[in-house]
């Protein structure tokens, strides 16, 4: 297959990999589909070089990332090791509170105002990032 | 001008199977998501499947899951739909859609339709 | 899923009346509400995106409003070649993405 070598149109390139930010809001699995469908996956942060740029992007805007913990252990949606990797948590963060009345704890990271990163549930409507690799295969195998 | 045309629709046995085309023109396919809609006679819309641009990634409506597969072929500028195991509650009119997308997404432009038929 | 119901299921009006058609989600959607027109035997047509943004092509006397969970569709002053079934869409929660029922706009 095809390797995408630019970024598509409105995405923004950075250190090989492109970024689409969303202006509108939507739960955190409806976050991860869209970005599915764009072949891309939601933002997943390497790096405080990585972290600083997403933030000037987003600016102090609630903000869906691909990390979770919804079926236990806390997992990047592209496989990235959470416990070895950059994190970036507010101070008592992630705290899985149930006090929000919503029903369960909070699964899902986001980008705070200040950057730093929060769990929360993963019904409430943020804004998200997509990220996706250049040079990785963008083509499934043509159809026999 | 930007152009979708369905093909393969027909009459065929429940049980059987049918694979049904979309071709695409007048814009550059491989940068965009498809989907495929239904709407059974006098009935409203149905979505059926989507497929991503690069065809990674797809998903299908609970009523097909399992029996129908969405695909495409950028290098022919054309999207299918296979359909397995066809009961007669899939007889409808299926439309290709292409997926606009800006956070907020919606259908457009349709093709024209193509109909499918499942009787004994 | 989110539904999305359509009133009336049909309505009856002359050349020149003002039509307004309502379609309400099952929970909230915000602004991610899109509307269609399908003339008997065509494909459907995007007539108006994201609640109110009319589809290049498509004349003023269309217009969009709502939010949340309530939204309506308003022809300003009925044209012969307005008369068709309308749908709305929802593309908060998706896949899948779901329509409503429709609304047959039939002449008076």
């Known amino acids: 297959g095809s390797e995408r070598t630019c970024c598509p149109v409105n995405w923004v390139e950075h250190e090989r990999s492109c970024y689409w930010f969303s202006r509108s809001g939507k739960a955190w699995a409806d976050a991860d589909n869209y970005c599915r469908l764009e072949d891309a996956h939601l933002v997943v942060v390497t790096s405080w070089e990585e972290q600083k740029f997403v933030q000037h992007h987003i600016g102090p805007v609630n903000t869906w990332m691909g990390l979770h913990d919804q079926n236990g252990p806390w997992k990047w949606v592209d496989g990235t090791d959470y416990e070895t990797g950059f994190k970036n948590w507010r101070p008592e963060q992630p705290d899985d509170w149930y006090g929000h009345g919503l029903g369960g704890g909070e699964d899902c990271a986001h980008f705070t105002d200040d950057g730093r990163w929060n769990d929360d549930v993963c019904q409430r409507p943020y804004r998200w990032v997509c990220e996706t690799e250049l040079d990785k295969a963008s083509q499934e195998p043509p159809l026999l | 001008q930007v152009q979708l045309v369905e093909s393969g629709g027909g009459v065929v046995q429940p049980g059987r199977s049918l694979r049904l085309s979309c071709a695409a023109s007048?814009?550059?396919?491989?940068?965009?998501?498809m989907h495929w809609v239904r709407q059974a006679p006098g009935k409203g819309l149905e979505w059926v499947a989507v497929?991503?641009?690069?065809?990674?990634?797809?998903y299908y409506a609970d009523s097909v899951k399992g029996r129908f597969t969405i695909s495409r072929d950028n290098s022919k500028n054309t999207l299918y739909l296979q359909m397995n195991s066809l009961r007669a509650e899939d007889t409808a009119v299926y439309y290709c859609?292409?997926?606009?997308?800006?956070?907020?997404?919606?259908?457009?432009?349709w093709g024209q339709g193509t109909l499918v038929t499942v009787s004994s | 899923d989110i539904q999305m119901t359509q009133s009336p299921s049909s309505l009856c009006a002359s050349v020149g009346d003002r039509v307004t058609i309502t379609c309400r989600a099952s929970?909230?959607?915000?602004?991610?509400l899109n509307w269609y027109q399908q003339k008997p035997g065509k494909a459907p047509k995007l007539l108006i995106y994201?609640?109110?943004s009319l589809q290049s092509g498509v004349p003023s006397r269309f217009s969009g409003s709502g939010s949340g969970t309530d939204f309506t569709l308003t022809i300003s002053s009925l044209q012969p070649e307005d008369f068709a079934t309308y749908y709305c869409?929802?593309?908060?929660?998706?896949?899948?993405?779901?329509f409503g029922q429709g609304t047959k706009v039939d002449i008076r």
């Open positions: 859609a292409r997926r606009y997308s800006s956070g907020w997404d919606w259908f457009d432009p």
């Open positions: 007048g814009f550059t396919f491989s940068s965009y998501g």
């Open positions: 497929i991503s641009s690069a065809g990674s990634n797809k």
């Open positions: 929970r909230n959607i915000s602004n991610y």
């Open positions: 994201v609640v109110s």
């Open positions: 869409q929802q593309s908060y929660s998706s896949p899948p993405w779901t």
